[in-house]
C-alpha cells in the first residue's frame, strides 16, 4: 500500500518550550472488561523480522488450514496465497472447505512496484493463539500475483487491520477486525509488540525465532515498561496520526509541522522502515550526518541500499543520534514523544560480509505519500490501536533493543500549541491511495 | 591536480614493523569527502584492502590484518600513514595508497607503490 | 563473505577486437561494483563505477552493465594501450574490501 519499502512488496512548529509541563489526565486509564491483565495466549504469537514481516498463525476452512499471516497495519484486505506459487509453502485450497462461499467476485490490487490479485469469498477464520472463537470473514483468495510474496518469508497471506475506507476492491467490502468484533464479544481494540532481533540473523534462526505478541482484544502489561500515551486517530481509514514535531539528539528540526504529516502519517506494521516527507528526510538525514560527523559513510547507505559493517560487537552505538517523534496527544495543547535509537533505524541484514561482522541498513528512508511509522518504530514500543476509542498508544516495548547508555522512551506531557494545523488535508479524488 | 606519493624504507627485517606514508599534494587531506586507504598486493597476486582513514582519524581495518595494522593521519603535514607490525615474508608487496571517492566507496585515485621486501 | 570471481582468467585477443570481461558475485550487490585496470608496473586505475558509470577522463569504448550478480565490462574494440588486467570490486558490503581475482587481456 506504501511504495518503496513497503511489506509486503519486498520493504507542530514546537510551540511553548518543553520545560513548560501539564498534569496528566490519569495515571492509569480505568479498568474495563477484558481489556487489560493477561493474555498468556497470545504472548509470543509473533514470528519474523523487521526485513520481511511479522506474521501470525491463523486456520481458514473447514477443516481447518493452517497459514501463516502476515500482520499489516497498513491495508484493509485478508488476503491469502490460493494458487501454487514458487514462494509458498502452502496456499489456502478452497476446494478442500466445506464451509467455503464464493462471493462471485474479483479483486485487484495493484502497488507501485508488483500486485496481487484473487477472487473473493468468505470462509471460518480462527487464531490457534488468539482469542477462542471463530468468526466467518471475508478473504480475497489470490490467484495472481507479482512481486507480493517474499522467498523464505514463510507467510503465505496477509491479514489488513486496518478500516474498511481502503478495503479493497471498496469501503463495502468488510475488513477481518470488524467481523471479529461484530461476531464476538471480542473488545475493539488489539496491540503489538514487534520485537526486533537487534542482530542479523541467518535463516533457521528467523524460523526459529520470537518476534513479537498481538494482543487481540486487549492489553497485557508484561509487553511494556512505564506509561501507555495516546494519541488521536485522525481519521479512520490508515492508522492516520499527528506528529507535531521532530528532533535528532534533542534538536528540533524546526520544520513547519504540516510537512511531517504531508500528505499523511501512519502506524503501519507492514512497513519495514520509518519513511518521512521528502523534505523532512533532507533535513533527518542531514543533522543524523552531522550528529555522527566523526564518521563518514556512503552515500547508497543513507539511501539505504549500501549495507556497512563492523567488527561484531564493535558497532559504535554511540555515535548515531536518538530521533524523537512528537505525537499529538489526547488533551488539548499536549503532545508527548516516542524516542528511538540506531539500535531500531539501523536494522542488522544477514551477515553478507563474513561471520565476524554485524552488518547493517540505514532503515529510514524517503516517502511521497507521507511520513510511515513502520517497523523500525514499532520495534521500539508497544502499540496499542484503541479502535473502540479512536486513538493509538504507545509504551516502551519490554523486548527492545538497547544498549547499558541509552532506551527508547515514550515522555510527556509537553506543550505543543496550534497542533491541529500540523494536519495536512488531503484533496478528495477517486484515486487509488495504493498507487501512491 | 592531486597526487599522492608512497615513502618508506623498500625492506624490511621478519618480525619488525613496517612503517610507510603517504603524502597528499594539490588537495587537502581534510576535505571531507573522501576517506584515505592502502591497497597491497603481492608479486605476481591480486589486491588486497588494507585499511583506511578519514581526516577525523575514524579507520577501518580488514579484519584479517587488523590485529597487526595502525593506520594515522597528520593533517598538518597531509600525509597518512600505515604501521604493519610482526611481518614476515607473506607481507612483501608493493603498497599502494589511494584515495576513496565517490561515495566513499572507489579508490578513484592512486599512488604509483612502493615495493617493501620482507627478508632478513 | 562475498566474494567475486572474474572470468576467463585470460582472455587473448587482437586490437580491434570486442572484449567481454565478467565478474560474478556470490550474493547481490546491487550495482555497487567497480572496474578497474592495472598495466605492468603501474597502479590500479578506475574505470567505470556503480557498474555503469564511466570515471573522469575514461575512453568511450570502455563500458560497463549489470547488477545484482553478474556483471560484465565491455571493450568495444581494443586499442594496444588496452592489454592489461582488469579488476572487479564490489562496495554494496562497506567497507568496500572486496576485489575479484582478475583477468588477464593479452595480445593475441
Known amino acids: 500500500t506504501q511504495h518503496g519499502i513497503r511489506l509486503p512488496l519486498r520493504s507542530g512548529l514546537g510551540g511553548a518550550p518543553l520545560g513548560l509541563r501539564l498534569p496528566r489526565e490519569t495515571d492509569e486509564e480505568p479498568e474495563e472488561p477484558g481489556r487489560r491483565g493477561s493474555f498468556v495466549e497470545m504472548v509470543d504469537n509473533l514470528r519474523g523480522k523487521s526485513g520481511q514481516g511479522y506474521y501470525v498463525e491463523m486456520t481458514v476452512g473447514s477443516p481447518p488450514q493452517t497459514l501463516n499471516i502476515l500482520v499489516d497495519t497498513g491495508s484493509s484486505n485478508f488476503a491469502v496465497g490460493a494458487a501454487p506459487h514458487p514462494f509458498l509453502h502452502r496456499y489456502y485450497q478452497r476446494q478442500l472447505s466445506s464451509t467455503y462461499r464464493d462471493l462471485r467476485k474479483g479483486v485487484y490490487v495493484p502497488y507501485t512496484q508488483g500486485k496481487w490479485e484473487g477472487e473473493l469469498g468468505t470462509d471460518l477464520v480462527s487464531i490457534p493463539h488468539g482469542p477462542n472463537v471463530t468468526v466467518r470473514a471475508n478473504i480475497a483468495a489470490i490467484t495472481e500475483s507479482d512481486k507480493f510474496f517474499i522467498n523464505g518469508s514463510n507467510w503465505e497471506g496477509i491479514l489488513g487491520l486496518a478500516y474498511a475506507e481502503i478495503a479493497r476492491p471498496d469501503d463495502s467490502l468488510e475488513p477481518f477486525f470488524d467481523s471479529l468484533v461484530k461476531q464476538t464479544h471480542v473488545p475493539n481494540l488489539f496491540s503489538l509488540q514487534l520485537c526486533g532481533a537487534g542482530f542479523p540473523l541467518n535463516q533457521s534462526e528467523v524460523l526459529a525465532s520470537v518476534g513479537g505478541s498481538m494482543i487481540i482484544g486487549g492489553i497485557d502489561h508484561s509487553l511494556y515498561t512505564g506509561s501507555l500515551w495516546y494519541t488521536p486517530i485522525r481519521r479512520e481509514w490508515y492508522y492516520e496520526v499527528i506528529i507535531v514535531r521532530v528532533e535528532i539528539n534533542g534538536q528540533d528540526l524546526k520544520m513547519d509541522c504540516k510537512e511531517y504529516n504531508y500528505d499523511k502519517s501512519i502506524v503501519d506494521s507492514g512497513t519495514t522502515n520509518l519513511r518521512l516527507p521528502k523534505k523532512v528526510f533532507e533535513a533527518a538525514v542531514k543533522s543524523i550526518k552531522a550528529a555522527s560527523s566523526t564518521e563518514k559513510f556512503p552515500d547508497g547507505f543513507w539511501l539505504g541500499e549500501q549495507l556497512v559493517c563492523w567488527q561484531a560487537g564493535t558497532t559504535p552505538w554511540n555515535i548515531f543520534p536518538v530521533i524523537s517523534l512528537y505525537l499529538m496527544g489526547e488533551v488539548t495543547n499536549q503532545s508527548f514523544r516516542i524516542t528511538i535509537l540506531p539500535q531500531q533505524y539501523l536494522r542488522p541484514v544477514e551477515d553478507v560480509a563474513t561471520s565476524q561482522d554485524d552488518c547493517y541498513k540505514f532503515a529510514i528512508s524517503q516517502s511521497s505519500t507521507g511520513t510511515v511509522m513502520g517497523a523500525v518504530i514499532m520495534e521500539g514500543f508497544y502499540v496499542v490501536f484503541d479502535r473502540a476509542r479512536k486513538r493509538i498508544g504507545f509504551a516502551v516495548s519490554a523486548c527492545h533493543v538497547h544498549d547499558e547508555f541509552r532506551t527508547a522512551a515514550v515522555e510527556g506531557p509537553f506543550v505543543t500549541l496550534d497542533m491541529e494545523d500540523c494536519g495536512y488535508n488531503i484533496p478528495q479524488t477517486d484515486e487509488s491511495t495504493l498507487m501512491t | 591536480q592531486l597526487q599522492l606519493q608512497e615513502s618508506g624504507p623498500g625492506l624490511v627485517k621478519p618480525s619488525e614493523t613496517l612503517s610507510l606514508t603517504c603524502t597528499v599534494s594539490g588537495g587537502s587531506i581534510s576535505r571531507g569527502s573522501y576517506y584515505w586507504g592502502w591497497i597491497r598486493q603481492p608479486p605476481g597476486k591480486g589486491l588486497e584492502w588494507i585499511g583506511m582513514i578519514y581526516y577525523s582519524g575514524s579507520t577501518w581495518y580488514n579484519p584479517s590484518l587488523k590485529s597487526r595494522v595502525t593506520i594515522s593521519v597528520d593533517t598538518s603535514k597531509n600525509q597518512f600513514s600505515l604501521k604493519l607490525s610482526s611481518v614476515t615474508a607473506a607481507d612483501t608487496a608493493v603498497y599502494y595508497c589511494a584515495r576513496v571517492g565517490h561515495g566513499v566507496s572507489y579508490f578513484d585515485l592512486w599512488g604509483r607503490g612502493t615495493l617493501v621486501t620482507v627478508s632478513s | 563473505e562475498i566474494v567475486l570471481t572474474q572470468s576467463p582468467a585470460t582472455l587473448s585477443l587482437s586490437p580491434g577486437e570486442r572484449a567481454t570481461l565478467s565478474c560474478r558475485a556470490s550474493q547481490s550487490v546491487s550495482s555497487y561494483l567497480a572496474w578497474y585496470q592495472q598495466k605492468p608496473g603501474q597502479a590500479p586505475r578506475l574505470l567505470i563505477y556503480?557498474?555503469?558509470n564511466r570515471a573522469t577522463g575514461i575512453p568511450a569504448r570502455f563500458s560497463g552493465s549489470g547488477s545484482g550478480t553478474d556483471f560484465t565490462l565491455t571493450i568495444s574494440s581494443l586499442e594496444p594501450e588496452d592489454f592489461a588486467v582488469y579488476y572487479c570490486q564490489q562496495a554494496y558490503v562497506w567497507p568496500p574490501r572486496t576485489f575479484g581475482g582478475g583477468t588477464k587481456v593479452e595480445i593475441k
Open positions: 556503480d557498474a555503469s
